[in-house]
């Protein structure tokens, strides 16, 4: 076909110059020579479809899929991956070829799959298909479960796409609030994938394999409960299933429930109702709103209305990519030696994050607690009053977040001294960082009150030990003080400490340590 453009598909493998966990470079820096992926016309396909050779990528590797188009005039394009459209900005190279690139940083299982590139040129439209898979180092995973409606039944199936295939259990609770904690007697667990009893107060599905346990709660609006002060919000990514349950109890059966999205009734096939009588003969109705695979236009206010209850709403937000929203500015804290204190990070994220707290190259478990306003909080209290730098790191499928904290412990200086043939040095790690004085002890000054100002060199931050600053002061030896005892004193707002040194000795000779409060 004369009109078809000349197309070249290439793979560029990048050498990440930082492969450390928890760091993400904005763009891989060093790249190897491009590998030609062929891009042959696909036979018997409707429309013009080019297919690139399959791409196998190592876990955590960074690559660029690139298409070079030799066609006259401007081109416009669109990438589609897993039903999501992704931004596409073509540019032109020195040979005036159109260049379209897709960068995949730190390859993960979630980024494996088919990448479709739709290109529109002045002459014709065509599609290019890339298939990207992870090289065969099997990755066991544990993914958050999701719900599906059971075919031809009013029941929910719980699915977790994990390996090894997880043990799935439903966690049900019929009481309110605190009594629905995991080990409470009010909690019932059912080790099965299908749940028929959907009237409970709190319904969660959990999946566990040797990597741990992940749970998903069935998002519920209860019309008999007082609405939250802030509107409940539910985040989903394009392509994920949406499930919202509306529940209402009334003295008799004479009431109905309806779902609306932005004041328009949900289409049939996007909801189903169930009802039952409770033990006290009141009627319980539940109405599910569900979308098997959400798109951007499913975003909005979902309102459940009843003929006998005030209506309530939830805001459903569909996002292209996951996110972690939090302030990443570093924070410094100053506490007393026995003061109770916890670091905390408040964030909003979807999908749920995994996080770690790190101090002195050691990682600590990270717990998250959901707040009523849609935010979550992670606290770290296990610092054991050790000063230094603490790092909070969070990741989900699509985003990474790091926040630094510095902890300073207010305490009186502790002084260590050492001497060489030419100088004497004193070190202290008190906080606030101490100031220094040097004094000479002589016949004229037996109490060591004669201050030395010549030859003193103070360094405020000599070395940083995991974020803990150490201050030092050095006295260069002169003939005037050789053979004498000298005293170095470090003082801050909490007190003073001193060390006495004999200056003619070649080695360290701490004579007396004075602790003057």
């Amino acid at each position: 076909n004369q009109d078809l453009p000349v197309i070249k598909c290439v793979l560029i493998n990048h050498k990440n110059n930082d492969s450390s966990v928890g760091k993400s470079s904005s763009y891989p820096m060093v790249s190897e020579s491009p590998e030609d992926l062929g891009c042959a016309l696909r036979p018997q396909s409707s429309g013009t479809v080019y297919e690139a050779a399959a791409v196998e990528v190592d876990v955590s590797a960074s690559i660029t899929l690139q298409v070079l188009v030799d066609a006259p005039g401007n081109i416009s394009c669109l990438w589609v991956f897993k039903h999501s459209s992704l931004n596409c900005q073509p540019h032109f190279d020195l040979q005036n070829r159109g260049v379209v690139s897709m960068v995949i940083l730190k390859m993960t299982e979630t980024q494996a799959g088919e990448y479709l590139l739709f290109i529109q040129s002045e002459a014709t439209n065509y599609t290019i298909l890339f298939t990207v898979s992870i090289r065969n180092t099997l990755l066991y995973t544990l993914r958050r479960p999701y719900f599906r409606k059971m075919e031809n039944q009013d029941a929910l199936v719980c699915i977790s796409e994990s390996v090894p295939e997880p043990i799935v259990e439903w966690v049900l609770c019929d009481s309110q609030g605190e009594s629905c904690k995991e080990e409470s007697p009010a909690v019932v667990k059912k080790e099965e994938k299908v749940l028929h009893e959907l009237f409970g107060t709190d319904i969660r599905c959990c999946a566990r394999n040797e990597l741990g346990r992940e749970c998903t709660r069935l998002f519920t609006i209860d019309l008999n409960q007082t609405p939250q002060t802030t509107l409940p919000q539910l985040f989903l990514k394009v392509g994920e299933p949406l499930w919202i349950r509306c529940k209402a109890v009334h003295v008799n059966h004479g009431f109905g429930l309806t779902w609306e999205l932005e004041n328009k009734a949900l289409e049939e096939g996007n909801y189903f109702e169930m009802s039952t009588y409770s033990t006290n003969r009141t009627m319980i109705r539940i109405l599910f709103a569900f979308v098997s695979s959400v798109a951007r236009n499913d975003t909005g206010y979902y309102t459940c209305s009843s003929s006998k209850h005030p209506s309530q709403s939830a805001l459903v937000t569909i996002v292209e990519k996951g996110f972690i929203n939090a302030t990443n500015s570093s924070e410094d804290y100053e506490i007393d030696q026995y003061e109770e204190f916890c670091f905390s990070v408040r964030f909003k994220a979807y999908p749920q994050i995994r996080c770690t707290w790190t101090f002195s190259r050691k990682s600590f478990p990270c717990e998250q607690k959901g707040l009523d306003n849609g935010y979550s909080i992670s606290k770290f209290c296990n610092h054991k009053h050790q000063p230094g730098e603490y790092i909070f790191h969070a990741e989900n499928d699509d985003a990474q977040f790091t926040k630094m904290f510095t902890l300073n412990i207010r305490r009186k200086p502790q002084v260590l001294a050492e001497a060489s043939a030419s100088q004497a040095s004193c070190f202290s790690d008190g906080y606030p960082l101490p100031s220094w004085t040097w004094k000479k002890c002589s016949d004229k000054s037996p109490n060591c009150t004669e201050e030395i100002t010549e030859g003193v060199w103070n360094r405020k931050a000599n070395r940083k030990v995991f974020g803990q600053w150490v201050s030092s002061s050095t006295l260069n030896m002169s003939e005037a003080i050789k053979g004498f005892l000298v005293k170095c004193c470090a003082y801050n707002s909490l007190g003073t400490s001193c060390e006495t040194i004999l200056l003619n000795s070649p080695g360290p000779f701490p004579f007396i340590q004075d602790n003057i409060s």
Partner: antibody, heavy 129, light 107 residues
Framework: QVQLVESGGGVVQPGRSLRLSCAAS????????MHWVRQAPGKGLEWVAV????????FYADSVKGRFTISRDNSKNTLYLQMNSLRAEDTAVYYC??????????????????????WGQGTTVTVSS | DIQMTQSPSSLSASVGDRVTITCRAS??????LNWYQQKPGKAPKLLIY???SLQSGVPSRFSGSGSGTEFTLTISSLQPEDFATYYC?????????FGGGTKVEIK
């Protein structure tokens, strides 16, 4: 070098208990899932149990569920198998084996899994009256 | 539980022969299958992981193939040190299950 050494085997009467240990060295023990596998005399291999890298999750073969408990002490680099209510059919050589290595890839926790790639030499358990 | 059926249960072969052992899973296990070699009185040794990936240090005469339910271990040219029992293992779901084993003997 990477090594696993089992101990604690012996002759025990039916209904009694025994505790096996597996000492690990040469690798970061706390980053790996760990398994117990057994082999009855003249028979094939039978998987017994697995424990996650942090000890929070365990899974068992139906034949030992409720009687055996797998556990670990990461501070001592040691894996354990507590065997209660022992039966004649539990007579076997018991091996410990290293499983997957923990990783976190973009928020998804996972194991890189190359199979049970390191095995101990085995310890013999004989259940007999 | 997933059943792993290994065949043959034993075979006789000569040095230099090409040997093929198969393993069939009762349901799909994707590529979550390993092959092990065991000699009398010794612990098993991993040969192949992920159905077809050769474990480092294992001679290239060993190869694995298959996915889903049908898997094959091939020894392209049998060597004297290859006479042993071979097991497959599925680790797609709990409980993990081994095949019954294939004993490769000298003809």
């Amino acid at each position: 070098q990477v090594q696993l050494v089992e101990s604690g085997g012996g002759v025990v009467q039916p209904g009694r208990s025994l505790r096996l240990s597996c000492a690990a060295s040469g690798f970061t023990f706390s980053s790996y899932g760990m398994h117990w596998v057994r082999q009855a005399p003249g028979k094939g291999l039978e998987w017994v149990a697995v424990i996650s890298y942090d000890g929070s999750n365990e899974f068992y073969a139906d034949s030992v569920k409720g009687r055996f408990t797998i556990s670990r002490d990461n501070s001592k680099n040691t894996l354990y198998l507590q065997m209660n209510s022992l039966r004649a059919e539990d007579t076997a050589v018991y091996y410990c084996a290293r499983g997957g290595e923990i990783t976190m890839v973009r928020g998804v926790i996972g194991y890189y899994y190359y199979g049970m790639d390191v095995w101990g030499q085995g310890t013999t358990v004989t259940v007999s009256s | 539980d997933i059943q792993m059926t290994q065949s043959p249960s034993s075979l006789s072969a000569s040095v230099g022969d090409r040997v093929t052992i198969t393993c069939r899973a009762s349901q799909s296990i994707s590529s979550y299958l390993n092959w092990y070699q065991q000699k009398p009185g010794k612990a098993p040794k991993l040969l192949i992981y992920a159905a077809s990936s050769l474990q480092s240090g294992v001679p290239s005469r060993f190869s694995g193939s298959g996915s889903g339910t049908e898997f094959t271990l091939t020894i392209s040219s049998l060597q004297p040190e290859d006479f042993a029992t071979y097991y497959c293992l599925q680790h797609n779901s709990y409980p993990l299950t081994f095949g019954g084993g294939t004993k490769v003997e000298i003809k």
